[in-house]
Interface confidence: medium
């Protein structure tokens, strides 16, 4: 495997683009059991209907790979654990990509992104010790291809869930 992006290995802030700029996805640093900061993106607007919060990564080079794999580690709160929000709370988010030769796209319209999948929390999860609490970490892998341009952007659409993206890794498999 060749890693193209690993959010856990980025030094400092990830600085991905959130839309809207406020009130949607927020970058939050948490500490793991070794007191090492983990950069996460979180959103939890479970009381308001019609949420449409987007988060997009920086440009990711494909390095000639035809097909890439996206591994997402995330937590997603069960709506039953959030009192009084059953009408508005969701338990999924959407994953998109946009191919581009431009590594500095300033603005990408929502309708330019291609949907990869709707992601839901699996029944299986890994328990991770984060300081004084246990975090239930889901892992989902999706693939996309064939790719033709020099690189691409990933985007995450929240539609009203209580979610934290803990790790995003993009890789391809060597032949």
């Amino acid at each position: 495997e060749v890693t193209l992006l690993d959010s856990r290995s980025v030094q400092g802030e990830l600085g991905w683009i959130a839309s809207p700029l406020e009130g949607g996805w927020e970058e939050v640093s948490i500490m793991d059991e070794k007191n090492t900061p983990i950069r996460t993106y979180q959103v939890c607007n479970v009381m308001e209907p019609s949420q449409n919060n987007w988060l997009r990564t920086d440009w990711i080079t494909r390095e000639g790979a035809q097909r890439v794999y996206i591994e997402i580690k995330f937590t997603l709160r069960d709506c039953n654990s959030l009192p009084g929000v059953m009408g508005t709370c969701k338990e999924t988010f959407n994953l998109y990509y946009y191919e581009s030769d431009n590594d500095k796209e300033r603005f990408i319209r929502e309708n330019q992104f291609v949907k990869i999948d709707t992601i839901a929390a699996d029944e299986s999860f890994t328990q991770v010790d984060i300081g004084d609490r246990i975090m239930k970490l889901n892992t989902e892998i999706r693939d996309v291809g064939p790719l033709s341009k020099k690189g691409f952007y990933l985007a995450f659409q929240d539609v009203g869930a209580c979610i934290a993206l803990v790790s995003v890794r993009v890789f391809y498999k060597k032949a």
Partner: nanobody, 118 residues
Framework: QVQLQESGGGVVQAGGSLRLSCAAS????????MGWFRQAPGTKREMIAA???????NYANPVKGRFTISRDDAKNMVYLQMNNLKPEDSAVYYC????????????WGPGTQVTVSS
């Protein structure tokens, strides 16, 4: 250990106002959205207001336009300004963190009783 202490409740006539306060300690609550919840006798606890780290607010429909949530991270405090109170607002009011990372709801403060008389 997370500790939450709500205060500011009381008895008030319909149409009156109250300001609830919540003191949070034992965790960096500035890292989380915070919410106010309430529970009337014989009903489930419901979330009525939330404020994100950035200060964005969300409200449940029954309190929208009447209640205002705010936070002061320097003091680790969360507030709920309640105006134009109605008898159906009578309940015990609680605050808590709203985190996607884990379920905070094994920690609850004692709450503060709000009674609205008609």
């Amino acid at each position: 250990q997370v500790q939450l202490q709500e205060s500011g409740g009381g008895v008030v006539q319909a149409g009156g106002s109250l300001r609830l306060s919540c003191a949070a300690s034992g965790r960096a609550f500035s890292s989380y959205a915070m919410g106010w919840f309430r529970q009337a006798p014989g009903t489930k606890r419901e979330m009525i207001a939330a404020v994100t780290r950035a200060g964005t607010t969300n409200y449940a429909n029954p309190v929208k336009g009447r209640f205002t949530i705010s936070r002061d991270d320097a003091k680790n405090m969360v507030y709920l300004q309640m105006n134009n109170l109605k008898p159906e607002d009578s309940a015990v009011y609680y605050c808590n963190a709203i985190s996607p990372l884990w379920d905070e709801y094994d920690f609850w403060g004692p709450g503060t009783q709000v009674t609205v008389s008609s």
